[in-house]
Amino acid sequence: IVLRPPRVHNSEENTMRALTLKDILNGTFSYKTFFPNWISGQEYLHQSADNNIVLYNIETGQSYTILSNRTMKSVNASNYGLSPDRQFVYLESDYSKLWRYSYTATYYIYDLSNGEFVRGNELPRPIQYLCWSPVGSKLAYVYQNNIYLKQRPGDPPFQITFNGRENKIFNGIPDWVYEEEMLATKYALWWSPNGKFLAYAEFNDTDIPVIAYSYYGDEQYPRTINIPYPKAGAKNPFVRIFIIDTTYPAYVGPQEVPVPAMIASSDYYFSWLTWVTDERVCLQWLKRVQNVSVLSICDFREDWQTWDCPKTQEHIEESRTGWAGGFFVSTPVFSYDAISYYKIFSDKDGYKHIHYIKDTVENAIQITSGKWEAINIFRVTQDSLFYSSNEFEDYPGRRNIYRISIGSYPPSKKCVTCHLRKERCQYYTASFSDYAKYYALVCYGPGIPISTLHDGRTDQEIKILEENKELENALKNIQLPKEEIKKLEVDEITLWYKMILPPQFDRSKKYPLLIQVYGGPCSQSVRSVFAVNWISYLASKEGMVIALVDGRGTAFQGDKLLYAVYRKLGVYEVEDQITAVRKFIEMGFIDEKRIAIWGWSYGGYVSSLALASGTGLFKCGIAVAPVSSWEYYASVYTERFMGLPTKDDNLEHYKNSTVMARAEYFRNVDYLLIHGTADDNVHFQNSAQIAKALVNAQVDFQAMWYSDQNHGLSGLSTNHLYTHMTHFLKQCFSLSD
């Protein structure tokens, strides 16, 4: 199926031009999405093009500026947050990025009633995290790893924790590994629905080994960055969950929530917290060997002022074929009875589906079923459940939004998005207002992205929020590559692939092939989304065919494919890329002497192993910030898929699956190895070890490092990186500059 819908036809073919590398580096063809900042059932905030904060009322059709760009500019604010009582706004400035999600900032509180900034008892700086209570205008914030509470913005703060210490004890914010691999947030505190209680995590990193690397900066001496970072098999952070009554915080102080006995008996993780009511909270825990997860529902005991988690309210989720969950263990969405919930987990056929759990997991009612997967539950109301899946027309790389009417029997299912803009839109997400009165649909492709507003009762489209008209006009004279998504059936495995073809593609000709690979567990590269990026340029201007293949270990096609790589990373992912390449050669339009592979992060690991596979298929390849040994990567991620690097567990495969072990096999390929020296995630150590092994084996290779750059290689490094990789590929494919 051809994915990119035909655009406005231009009769003057000579006015059409190919994409340039400059187009990509300048972000000329980037798109916009519109996610309403919902503040009620029918109102949302949005930052206008001129930086005013505007409140829109869908029902009255009125809008007004609640915060002017002048006020924003007065403190150089780049972000804002309205208090639920609409009396105050926090303004965020001096943004300073830390890790993937975390950053510090300076916060100012603006009083909307008098049009002035709150003076007296100002917030300290820099703050690590700040948020309003869900009701009223209480503030919780984290400063120097401790949590503080303000009843009102102008009040003096109440200090909740006192033991916070840099790189040792983290309160209300995650340490490195929890941020990156478990919570995927910058915060680790959660208000109860009406703001009565505040729950928070305390992470003790005292005994965790530290990764230290040089940050060269501009000074005479480099400084050393130290991060408590547990690598596979190392000592992990110790986590505790506390809850404090924010009305009378000094009364009994923070109360610890007990850990389920079956979890506490060995190393464990806390995976998420979901408030159900002000006096009921749901915690999810995970054994260090991540195939057992326990969901624990805890109730506040007024008489003792403690939290009780009865064993009858513990629900166990266990995988016998792999790890628990997909990338993460799914989180529950509670129904109106405040005890039963909806949750996505594997059904008996090994597909992730929505289940309804009341008393026990064994008695769960399966809500969705089929040889496809439910991906996200967006919202549950009294009569509807909204979720996304890849069911429609059996394309795993699509996302449509569905509504199940749960208020009647039998529950009927309706696809809300399947036929809205079928050619243009096959990959959606959604954002719902309170009680799902209204919702925004954000379509990511395969055509030009579009965001629309809908009535939550009738699903009628109310208005277009963003349709990227400028982008559409800019693309009218661009020769974009053609894209197709198809599948290969190989040995009872379905390999979905996306092929990006030059604009004047002719099947009777031969083209160089570039494989772009990620291939990490529970990832998906073959998606029906719009993108004008580096590989689009390589196809459009340089005449390459680019292919992306989802092999074993990838997501949303059932557990058989997903868990195939369990305890065996680096084997089947590579095999499946190679198998696909052989199939592409059979198609007749690939020049088998000009095949390359490249990937970043996990993709750098797979591309390295593919180059070192000894098949002779690849002429050259690039690895950007690759993992080279699973012993060097984070415990939480690595052990989920590989178990422990111990003799009685999986040490043998840890050793067998390194890139270094295959150094000799790089002799007959051109290899470009790239890494940032300040990569906090996949440490420079990984590439240093590859380089050392290649040198020791006397194998020639090319390398590039990016000083003081992290895993993202952002800013000017991005331009340098893509320019450098382009030269490398053109040289490999004997394409003239």
């Epitope: 309210q313 129904s335 008695n363 749960i406 029997y409």
Partner: antibody, heavy 122, light 107 residues
Framework: EVQLLESGGGLVQPGGSLKLSCAAS????????MSWVRQAPGKGLEWIGE????????NYTPSLKDKFIISRDNAKNTLYLQMTKVRPEDTALYYC???????????????WGQGTTVTVSS | ELVMTQSPASLSASVGETVTITCRAS??????LAWYQQKQGKSPQLLVY???TLADGVPSRFSGSGSGTQYSLKINSLQPEDFGSYYC?????????FGGGTKLEIK
Amino acid sequence: EVQLLESGGGLVQPGGSLKLSCAASGFDFSTYWMSWVRQAPGKGLEWIGEINPDSSTINYTPSLKDKFIISRDNAKNTLYLQMTKVRPEDTALYYCAGGYYRYPYYYTMDYWGQGTTVTVSS
Amino acid sequence: ELVMTQSPASLSASVGETVTITCRASGSIHNYLAWYQQKQGKSPQLLVYNAKTLADGVPSRFSGSGSGTQYSLKINSLQPEDFGSYYCQHFWSTPYTFGGGTKLEIK
């Protein structure tokens, strides 16, 4: 008008078998959860078991699990209770009851039949 | 299996009085509770579900309340037709057991 009509009761010897039926009318039987409940003479109500609309879920009270079988035929609008290995203590008035779907995913016993009497005696 | 303990087993009251029947579960049933009325020689009739929601056609003098393990059925201003037996039943987890019943008689 909703009607549930039990039949098949009578005198049965200990160790014997009996099949009770419950004919439904006046509502969409194929969308209702159905249950059997019994009441021994002068005693309270005892829940026997339930069956969901498409027969994919059938639950019993543990003590009766191995001797009673609940089934349904949606085409015939009929619910069944197969009783085996009966004992004198199974003597009771047997009711079938039908339930509305209630959010979220459970039912209540809104409609009851008039009951059929089973006497177990030698 | 959850045990439902109903009290009192019997009580006598006069027309116009208010009575309360209680039901205690051996574990939390999270409001998944129904109340039934059964008159002599008749089938039971649903009065209340979800612990406090009145079934269709049930007079407003009946009301259900409670949470966790403790629930009650209150009848305000007793009418002659209210006399009979009352049963609670939980719907939390199978088996859906009944309470032992409360016999309400005319004083």
